[in-house]
Interface confidence: medium
């Protein structure tokens, strides 16, 4: 594939990466399908720097980001390490709360209202923020 | 204080529209989710529709799908209710009511209710 | 779709009771449960939201509990105020869907 040099249309370019912000709301799993079949992935965060853009665009509510404990460790969509990466927690948190009856905990990861991070149950319709990185290869053939 | 007022409900024949209206006031109108919430007489309360705070989502029921449309004028501080192709299954009291957050965490303030009645 | 069933659908009691309606989710909702209060040809009125919080301004005689698909509103010392119809509502995703009601009548 063609290696990608600029963000799509209606994407934020931001430290060679681009961010695409949803109006709407979908489930964690349906955000990050989403995100797939877009060539990207639901946004990693790996900086306070990346933290603050990303709270900048999405004000105060609640958005989903890609990551999620729902095989059991705490992992990034893109594979980025969780144990030794940036965290911004609320206090308190993740608890993994069991009580709701879903099964497993509270599995998927938030930016809240203060931009801190929750756990929360995956099936909430929240916002959600894409990223996919520039010079990356893109799926798509190189134009003739 | 937070108040809810509708209007614009009345006597209407099967097949044809009506727009009910919701008029806020006493709390920013932009910062908040609104939903219609109906009750058929003599039955529980059915939620019909939800706006998120800036317009940008809109969730219905399958029952009004693709014949209601939901939405809001932050210049008026008024949610709207466009209710096309009416059944007699639509007859019922309207409420407005606001979302505890942006839109997606129930209601809190409801208001009076317009009734709407579809008969031919 | 999540189905909410309220039980019972009536209830006859007296001035100072302890009254329980309970809800029961198809499926389980964490805690994204409100309760509300309507009285004949009036507005619902906001009771319980988050499954146990009170709503600002509501007497602390009402109280909720519960997670997962199983609720419960307890009223601890019934009043003829309190005579009206209940419901519950989930708010887990779209769509939201109510319960079907819990009359509470003079016994």
């Known amino acids: 594939g063609s290696e990608r040099t600029c963000c799509p249309v209606n994407w934020v370019e931001h430290e060679r990466s681009c961010y695409w912000f949803s109006r709407s709301g979908k489930a964690w799993a349906d955000a990050d399908n989403y995100c797939r079949l877009e060539d990207a992935h639901l946004v990693v965060v790996t900086s306070w720097e990346e933290q603050k853009f990303v709270q900048h665009h999405i004000g105060p509510v609640n958005t989903w980001m890609g990551l999620h404990d729902q095989n059991g460790p705490w992992k990034w969509v893109d594979g980025t390490d969780y144990e030794t990466g940036f965290k911004n927690w609320r206090p308190e948190q993740p608890d993994d709360w069991y009580g709701h009856g879903l099964g497993g905990g509270e599995d998927c990861a938030h930016f809240t209202d203060d931009g801190r991070w929750n756990d929360d149950v995956c099936q909430r319709p929240y916002r959600w923020v894409c990223e996919t990185e520039l010079d990356k290869a893109s799926q798509e053939p190189p134009l003739l | 204080q937070v108040q809810l007022v509708e209007s614009g409900g009345g006597v209407v024949q099967p097949g044809r529209s009506l727009r009910l209206s919701c008029a806020a006031s006493g709390f920013t109108f932009s910062s908040y989710g609104m939903h219609w919430v109906r009750q058929a007489p003599g039955k529980g309360l059915e939620w019909v529709a939800v706006?998120?705070?800036?317009?940008?989502?809109?969730n219905y029921a399958d029952s009004v799908k693709g014949r209601f449309t939901i939405s809001r004028d932050h210049s008026k501080n008024t949610l709207y209710l466009q209710m096309n192709s009416l059944r007699a299954e639509d007859t019922a009291v309207y409420y407005c009511?606001?979302?505890?957050?942006?839109?997606?965490?129930?209601?809190?303030?409801w208001g009076q209710g317009t009734t709407v009645t579809v008969s031919s | 779709d999540i189905q909410m069933t309220q039980s019972p659908s009536s209830l006859s009691a007296s001035v100072g009771d302890r009254v329980t309606i309970t809800c029961r989710a198809s499926q389980g909702i964490s805690n994204y449960l409100a309760w509300f209060q309507q009285k004949p040809g009036k507005a619902p009125k906001s009771l319980i939201y988050?499954?146990?919080n009170l709503q600002s301004g509501v007497p602390s005689k009402f109280s909720g509990s519960g997670s997962g698909t199983d609720f419960t509103l307890t009223i601890s010392s019934l009043q003829p105020e309190d005579f009206a119809t209940y419901y519950c509502?989930?708010?887990?995703?779209?769509?939201?869907?109510f319960g079907g009601g819990t009359k509470v009548e003079i016994k």
């Open positions: 009511a606001r979302d505890r957050d942006v839109g997606y965490n129930g209601m809190d303030v």
């Open positions: 509502l989930h708010y887990l995703n779209y769509p939201l869907t």
């Open positions: 988050a499954a146990s």
């Open positions: 706006i998120w705070y800036d317009g940008s989502n809109k």
